[in-house]
Amino acid sequence: QNASRGRRQRRMHPNVSQGCQGGCATCSDYNGCLSCKPRLFFALERIGMKQIGVCLSSCPSGYYGTRYPDINKCTKCKADCDTCFNKNFCTKCKSGFYLHLGKCLDNCPEGLEANNHTMECVSIVHCEVSEWNPWSPCTKKGKTCGFKRGTETRVREIIQHPSAKGNLCPPTNETRKCTVQRKKCQKGERGKKGRERKRKKPNKGESKEAIPDSKSLESSKEIPEQRENKQQQKKRKVQDKQKSVSVSTVH
């Protein structure tokens, strides 16, 4: 902490400000600081069997500051709370507890999941995928000519990766058989890869059976309608980025 502490003074008079060190406004030999200079917080520090007053520029971890007209003082957070905003709301929980809306919980409420990195209860994020891209041209061994039966593929992107409890992503690749009117390869066409040519319409009489690519078969659970909106995700990223610098406290 960036604390300026008022040391105990060898003085007989408990309410004399002259000679008080650090941030003390008034002090006594036995009790340390009795009051603090403006803007500093008064806190009681236990030393052995007795408590002495100290003046701090910010409250230590586990305490929150309250500013009153006559005194600024540090008050202890709840037992399960490491740092807090005030007596009602925690900003960081003690080890083994998860923060949810200012509360410290040993288990996250239903519909939320524990993030063991930030030690918070967070919304479950489900997989989100884009629309399918158009089918690729019908190809065989990388060629678009010189055959009758081939395959065509289409892909889609993962827009949102799921969180631990979220629905897994459906296949992102799909392949199906297709047929073309057999035609000879032209001189320049030989070996031309399918992706190099755009196909406007589906081929006449092509097979409709689609085979999901085994590589991308994670799961085909549905994507629920309720998702975190993009702005919420952006804000969460900003917050998480800042938390990773070091965990937020509010003193």
């Epitope: 500051g65 905003f85 809306l101 200012g102 309720q226 969460r236 900003v238 937020s248 509010v250």
Partner: antibody, heavy 123, light 111 residues
Framework: QVQLQQSGAELVRPGVSVKISCKGS????????IHWVKQSHAKSLEWIGV????????SYNQKFKGKATMTVDKSSSTAYMELARLTSEDSAIYYC????????????????WGAGTSVTVSS | DIVLTQSPASLTVSLGQRATISCRAS??????????MHWYQQKPGQPPKLLIY???NLESGVPARFSGSGSRTDFTLTIDPVEADDAATYYC?????????FGGGTKLEIK
């Protein structure tokens, strides 16, 4: 879209109480907290307090303790604030505002505001 | 309470020029790598609207002409270039410490 709809203007006599409402729509109400803010000519904007819609835990600005009481009804996605023993000092526009998404109060800045409820105290 | 002092109280800027609004906090609003200062715009008869959060992050849908900077006790909202629609009162607000507090506002007029 995300909206906070506040109840209509109130003209009340000194000494009585008034309860104003704020209904959230277009988002999951219990994922966010609700703040109440007072705007008067004399004092610009003043934060009254915040309530977690999920738990109903409230925290008040010391200045408004005993004056304001915040409650929430999850079933109707509505937050309420009751102002007691009204005086001319309480004449102002009262806004409800949604706190940004986050578990720590440090992140509960005001990202969506209601249109405001005008309260006039006059005999 | 943390007192936020905005300056100037009012400001007149020519269309297309830069407007700079300052907000000074009586205590630091930084805590362990975070800066809990935010900026709002309010037009007559309307509620305030969030422009900048956590000192420098632009809220979704807010034009990039608006930017925020600063840390600890000194903060700046910059509008560059100013447009006619930017005529409003601007407020800074902190939530580093209970209670949350607002600045007194800066009224921006466009000529």
């Amino acid at each position: 879209q995300v909206q906070l709809q506040q109840s209509g203007a109130e003209l009340v006599r000194p000494g009585v109480s008034v309860k104003i409402s704020c209904k959230g729509s277009g988002y999951t109400f219990t994922d966010y907290v609700i703040h109440w803010v007072k705007q008067s000519h004399a004092k610009s904007l003043e934060w009254i307090g915040v309530i977690t819609t999920y738990y109903g835990d409230a925290s008040y600005n010391q200045k408004f303790k005993g004056k304001a009481t915040m409650t929430v009804d999850k079933s109707s996605s509505t937050a309420y604030m009751e102002l007691a023993r009204l005086t001319s000092e309480d004449s102002a526009i009262y806004y409800c505002a949604r706190g940004a998404y986050g578990n720590s109060p440090s992140y509960w800045y005001f990202d969506v505001w209601g249109a405001g409820t005008s309260v006039t105290v006059s005999s | 309470d943390i007192v936020l002092t905005q300056s100037p109280a009012s400001l007149t800027v020519s269309l297309g020029q830069r407007a700079t609004i300052s907000c000074r906090a009586s205590e630091s609003v930084d805590s362990y790598g975070n800066t809990f200062m935010h900026w709002y715009q309010q037009k007559p008869g309307q509620p305030p609207k969030l422009l900048i959060y956590l000192a420098s992050n632009l809220e979704s849908g807010v034009p990039a002409r608006f930017s925020g900077s600063g840390s600890r006790t000194d903060f700046t909202l910059t509008i560059d270039p100013v447009e006619a629609d930017d005529a409003a009162t601007y407020y800074c607000q902190q939530n580093n410490e209970d209670p949350y507090t607002f600045g007194g506002g800066t009224k921006l007029e466009i000529k």
